[in-house]
């Protein structure tokens, strides 16, 4: 029961985490800054991974996409890549973990297969969470680096003056969403890995079985008993087939050249 709960909770936490990673990746508020403040209108800028937006105190907003790939900083490309890899891994992990859930029965899937799938999805969630945390942290570092470079320059260009002002960017809401979502995905992945240990058959308690041959050319068929974890239908070591086999509890057998223990 505890294993099922751990696995289910891990799945739900990871699901929330991956939804958060997707939300953070799509959000425009990765960084925010005050552009300028004339006596009438305050103008703000917020930037995401895909576009930049300018919002005015009046509520008017205009957004423009980063249409060029070559002109974008390598760091931004790296952040985009990390977030997308995180989403893809997380989505695959979710798909795998659905089939791995203890409460869902798919055909005659063995517990060992479910354990493997749980472990696989857990690792995927951990890597997905790490990718998101890394992506958000790289972006945050980019902003912190720029924070200490507040400068203003004025130079004469063709047809007038060009004024460049380095305003201070601050962390946007998407960074916090990304950090939390990455953390949740990571925690969910760890929970899935813990649940995997409980699902895997740790020991195989076979009862000794003596097979009594009825003829001289009877072949031994292995696998008379299934290893049980206590969760399947075969909770006690029951006979699967009867072909001349008796457990030692049932009959006292005498050694012969056809006995296999």
């Amino acid at each position: 029961m505890a294993v099922t709960a751990c696995q289910g909770l891990g799945f739900v936490v990871s699901l929330i985490g991956i939804a958060g990673i997707i939300a953070a990746t799509c959000m425009d508020q990765w960084s925010t800054q005050d552009l300028y403040n004339n006596p009438v209108t305050a103008v703000f800028n917020y930037q995401g991974l895909w576009r930049s937006c300018v919002r005015e105190s009046s509520g008017f907003t205009e957004c423009r996409g980063y249409f060029t790939l070559l002109g974008l900083p390598a760091m931004l490309q790296a952040v985009r890549a990390l977030m997308i890899v995180g989403i893809v891994l997380g989505a695959i992990g979710l798909l795998v973990s659905i089939f791995a859930l203890k409460c869902i029965r798919i055909g005659s899937m063995e517990d060992s297969a479910k354990a493997n799938m749980t472990l696989t999805s857990g690792i995927m969630f951990i890597v997905s969470g790490l990718c998101a945390i890394a992506g958000v942290s790289v972006f945050a570092n980019m902003l912190v680096t720029n924070f200490w470079m507040s400068t203003a320059n004025m130079y004469t260009g063709m047809g007038g003056m060009v004024q460049t002002v380095q305003t201070r960017y601050t962390f946007g809401a998407a960074l916090f969403v990304g950090w939390v979502a990455g953390g949740l995905t990571l925690i969910g992945g760890v929970m899935m890995c813990i649940a995997c240990r409980g699902l895997a058959p740790e020991e195989t308690n076979y009862k000794a079985v003596s097979y009594h041959a009825s003829g001289h050319s009877v072949a031994y068929k292995p696998g008379g008993f299934k290893a049980s974890t206590g969760f399947g239908s075969n909770t006690k070591n029951k006979k699967i087939y009867d072909g001349g086999a008796r457990t030692e509890d049932e009959v006292q057998s005498y050694p012969s050249k056809h006995d296999y223990v």
């Epitope: 800054q33 930037q47 930049s52 423009r64 720029n146 003056m161 004024q163 305003t167």
Partner: nanobody, 124 residues
Framework: QVQLVESGGGLVQAGGSLRVSCAAS????????MAWYRQAPGNEREFVAR?????????SYADSVKGRFTISRNTAKNTVYLQMNSLKPEDTAMYYC????????????????WGQGTQVTVSS
């Protein structure tokens, strides 16, 4: 880069009208908004009016000119106009056109382009 050239300034009587223009050339697609500022001798440069270049062209004005001045734009001609009515002697100043480039660089610098200015003198 964006180049700005102002024109239309001159001498006008108090209570009269004047229209100044600002023609933009170069990378005008990168402009977010355009504004007019003025600087009287011995004073600091002050904001007059602004207009958003695209998306409906929302406007804002300094309290001192509200109701008297009107800012407009013609994106086809890449020109911004400032229609000045009921002029007062205190409106005498050098009028500068300013374009603000839409910030498309993460953590990058904000770029403002300024024209050379056009002189407006209001006589009493």
């Amino acid at each position: 880069q964006v180049q700005l050239v102002e024109s239309g300034g001159g001498l006008v009587q108090a209570g009269g009208s004047l229209r100044v223009s600002c023609a933009a050339s170069g990378r005008t697609s990168s402009i977010y908004d355009m504004a007019w500022y003025r600087q009287a001798p011995g004073n600091e440069r002050e904001f007059v009016a602004r207009i958003v270049w695209r998306s409906g062209g929302s406007t804002s004005y300094a309290d001192s000119v509200k109701g008297r001045f009107t800012i407009s734009r013609n994106t086809a001609k890449n020109t911004v106009y400032l229609q000045m009515n009921s002029l007062k002697p205190e409106d005498t100043a050098m009028y500068y056109c300013r374009a603000f480039e839409f910030p498309l660089q993460i953590g990058g610098q904000n770029v403002y382009y300024w024209g050379q200015g056009t002189q407006v003198t209001v006589s009493s």
